[in-house]
Interface confidence: low
């Protein structure tokens, strides 16, 4: 089951996924001057069985120099508003992504590909938030946020997180950023 | 709102070339991928191919793959259909379909009917 | 790249509840949760009812649902209305980024 919304916009921090549930879509985008092989996968998809998850498809960028188009990414964030756009970057936690069964580790980079990544995620999904640089984390609440289906709809749990610049009064001085906290951990996917 | 708008029907004879056309309206255009279906008089859809009209990225179902050719003009939001030698057998209704969330064809156009007849 | 396999007929009266079968194979259905099924009513172009196998768009009735299991995917329709009365292709995204279609089934809705 798909995740109907985009995990919550936190101001000034962004957001990643440790590990990718089985039947996430990463959408295969290539950086400007860059498209699609010809044939290649439109998108690559976490599959696998009880013992092994790994990536179906793989992405494949070509330049596109021999055209007078350049490849747009599908879909525009900003025009199809289907999932939220993350941004390339090293993981914020040290979770072991090999040991969690039924999910995919970050699918590594290809040639040529778009700067940022927009993936569809699906019920049971989890990402953490981080302040971004310059910014630091003023609540000591869950940096993480979970989709979940209630009652038929799938909605994204609120992160406890409040980013505010580095010149401001900070409750927890030494705080840089947010930590997962136990309590935070996500209820049964299927609650009613 | 969101809509395809599809050229009118086509009455042709065997061996003649014939170009039809999908216009998007409502909606990015460049932004979403474009399919071809067939459906033949009587009988099932069938998918023919899909293209990215962005930048003319372009797909064909191995059944159609030289059979047809799928093109775009990003400038005017139009997807093409065209055949260089029609044959009696694509008599059939040609729809054109935006491919929006979730690898779902969400929007439909009205469909062309294309009829070949000596 | 074969069509997925649906019965090409079912009926029933109103007030009852079918179910629509489509078999693929492993390269498509049973690959991703990337199947839709569409309505077409007589003389009318295709309209999306359910997509991810049972999700539906805004304006779709709730009667229609989906399930997956394998490599066949089903329709079921409740409450059978006579305005339900169409044919019904499955379609499924495949391993080779392409899209196949069911051959489709024809709904009756006995009077």
């Known amino acids: 089951e798909l995740c109907d919304d985009d995990p919550p916009e936190i101001p000034h921090a962004t957001f990643k996924a440790m590990a990718y549930k089985e039947g996430t879509m990463l959408n295969c985008e290539c950086k400007r001057g860059f498209r699609r092989i010809k044939s290649g996968s439109l998108y690559m998809l976490c599959t696998g069985n009880s013992s092994h998850s790994s990536w179906d498809n793989q992405c494949q960028c070509t330049s596109s120099a021999t055209r007078n188009t350049t490849k747009q990414v599908t879909p525009q964030p900003e025009e199809q508003k289907e999932r939220k756009t993350t941004e390339m970057q090293s993981p914020m936690q040290p979770v072991d992504q090999a040991s969690l069964p039924g999910h995919c580790r970050e699918p590594p980079p290809w040639e040529n590909e778009a700067t940022e990544r927009i993936y569809h995620f699906v019920v049971g999904q989890m990402v953490y938030y981080q302040c971004v640089q310059g910014y630091r984390a003023l609540h000591r609440g869950p940096a993480e946020s979970v989709c979940k289906m209630t009652h038929g709809k799938t909605r994204w749990t609120q992160p406890q997180l409040i980013c505010t610049g580095e010149m401001e009064t900070s409750q927890f001085p030494g705080e840089e950023k947010p930590q997962a906290s136990p309590e935070g951990r996500p209820e049964s996917e299927t609650s009613c | 709102q969101v809509q395809l708008v599809q050229s009118g029907a086509e009455v042709k004879k065997p061996g003649e070339s014939l170009k039809i056309s999908c216009k998007g309206s409502?909606?990015?255009?460049?932004?979403?991928?474009i399919g071809w279906v067939r459906q033949m008089p009587g009988k099932g859809l069938e998918w023919m191919g899909i293209?990215?009209?962005?930048?003319?990225?372009?797909r064909y179902s191995p059944s159609f793959q030289g059979q047809v050719t799928i093109s775009a003009d990003k400038s005017i939001s139009t997807a093409y259909l065209q055949w260089s030698s029609l044959k009696a057998s694509d008599t059939a209704m040609y729809y054109c379909?935006?491919?929006?969330?979730?690898?779902?064809?969400?929007?439909w156009g009205r469909g062309t009917m294309v009829t070949v007849s000596s | 790249q074969s069509a997925l396999t649906q019965p090409a007929s079912v009926s029933a009266s109103p007030g009852q509840s079918i179910t629509i079968s489509c078999t693929g194979t492993?390269?498509?259905?049973?690959?991703?949760?990337?199947v839709s099924w569409y309505q077409q009513l007589s003389g009318k172009p295709p309209k999306l009812i359910l997509y991810?196998?049972?999700k539906r768009p805004s304006g779709i009735s709730d009667r229609f649902s989906g399930s997956k299991s394998g490599n066949t995917a089903s329709l079921t329709i409740s409450g059978l209305q006579a305005d339900d009365e169409a044919d019904y292709y499955c379609?499924?995204?495949?391993?080779?980024?392409?899209?196949?279609f069911g051959g489709g089934t024809q709904l009756t809705v006995l009077g």
């Open positions: 379909a935006r491919l929006g969330s979730y690898a779902a064809f969400d929007i």
């Open positions: 991810d196998v049972s």
């Open positions: 293209i990215y009209p962005g930048d003319s990225d372009t």
């Open positions: 409502g909606y990015s255009s460049t932004s979403y991928w």
């Open positions: 379609s499924s995204y495949t391993r080779s980024s392409t899209w196949v």
């Open positions: 492993s390269s498509d259905v049973g690959a991703y949760i990337y």
